[in-house]
């Protein structure tokens, strides 16, 4: 089978600070040296890119400075963290993995992680 399988958790609950973390694991059919990981958000039938990073195997993955994502990699596993989430960001977050080099190219699409975000209650005014 030439398809690349990507696994990610079905559900994750963001912290009260709007941070959600999940693992994206892929079964590489070949020995890739350069991998691109993209987080996509699917709302209704619309798909948008949340963040993307390319990394060389054995090195850390680096997102752009203004990205809301951070992550670390270990072998065929990527630990992704998305920050600054609010209740309106609740949705399905899909992990996309592309083995860019060496040939052949492979694409892997996860089933998505449903991230639930609950905005914290505002602190009541104190009488002090």
């Amino acid at each position: 089978c030439k398809a690349m399988h990507v696994a990610q958790p079905a559900v994750v609950l963001a912290s009260s600070r709007g941070i959600a973390s999940f693992v994206c694991e892929y079964a590489s059919p070949g020995k890739a040296t350069e991998v691109r990981v993209t987080v996509l958000r699917q709302a209704d039938s619309q798909v948008t890119e949340v963040c993307a990073a390319t990394y060389m195997m054995g090195n850390e993955l680096t997102f752009l400075d203004d990205s809301i994502c951070t992550g670390t990699s270990s072998g065929n596993q990527v630990n992704l963290t998305i920050q600054g989430l609010r209740a309106m960001d609740t949705g399905l977050y899909i992990c996309k993995v592309e083995l860019m080099y060496p040939p052949p190219y492979y694409l892997g699409i996860g089933n998505g992680t449903q991230i639930y975000v609950i905005d914290p209650e505002p602190c009541p005014d104190s009488d002090f």
Epitope: K2, A3, M4, E34, V47, Y105, Y106, L107
Partner: antibody, heavy 118, light 108 residues
């Protein structure tokens, strides 16, 4: 408007060269992989070439390897296909296509005709 | 290279009837990586179905996709006049990207 517009096709003699261009608009060009696909008269679709987001990685069909070169200029939102040592069997409509976020070719240009004949 | 074989080559159907198109892969294709396109004469292909069964934006629900592994199907439940065209399947999970040879759906 989200669109792709090809140009540069025409009539060329066997052994000649041609450079095709594809102008993208209405979307963040650098966030997508791009492809060239061709269709010979009365025939089916044949994938020709792929280029990665930053242009660092390129793949080619065996039928064009060593003769065609794909490139992109993200600053100009443009995709190119340099075709050298053209043969009669390269005669086709050439389409540029966007590799969608989930993989399929979700946006196509109108195509540009390349005819290789003496 | 994954070879995709479509059948039949030509399908003659009356408007309002159901059309079933087949696409068989030479080796297993993950269902996330199989697409169907429609092409009318003189026009560029248009994405209909991706991920084997998800309809692309703006595609009417009379088009549906199914299948997994090596066998995939595109079904048009009730053919409208504008549906008479050539249909291609494609795998996009690995290079080289490959298309089937196409099925022409013509008016009976």
């Amino acid at each position: 408007e989200v669109q792709l517009v090809e140009s540069g096709g025409g009539l060329v003699k066997p052994g000649g060269s041609l450079r095709l261009s594809c102008a993208a608009s209405g979307f963040t060009f650098s966030s997508y992989t791009m492809h060239w696909v061709r269709q010979a008269p009365g025939k089916g679709l044949e994938w020709v070439s792929f280029i990665s987001y930053d242009g660092n990685h390129k793949y080619y069909a065996d039928s064009v390897k060593g003769r065609f070169t794909i490139s992109r200029d993200n600053a100009k939102n443009s995709l190119y296909l340099q075709m050298n040592s053209l043969r009669a069997e390269d005669t086709a409509v050439y389409y540029c296509a966007r590799g969608g976020l989930l993989g399929p070719f979700d946006l196509w240009g109108q195509g540009t005709m390349v005819t290789v004949s003496s | 290279e994954i070879v995709l074989t479509q059948s039949p080559g030509t399908l003659s159907v009356s408007p309002g009837e159901r059309a079933t198109l087949s696409c068989r892969a030479s080796q297993s294709v993950g269902s996330s990586y199989l697409a169907w396109y429609q092409q009318k004469p003189g026009q560029a292909p248009r994405l209909l179905i991706y991920g084997a069964f998800s309809r692309a934006t703006g595609i009417p629900d009379r088009f549906s996709g199914s299948g997994s592994g090596t066998d995939f199907t595109l079904t048009i439940s009730r053919l409208e006049p504008e549906d008479f065209a050539v249909y291609y399947c494609q795998q996009y999970g690995s290079s080289p990207w490959t298309f089937g040879q196409g099925t022409k759906v013509e008016i009976k």
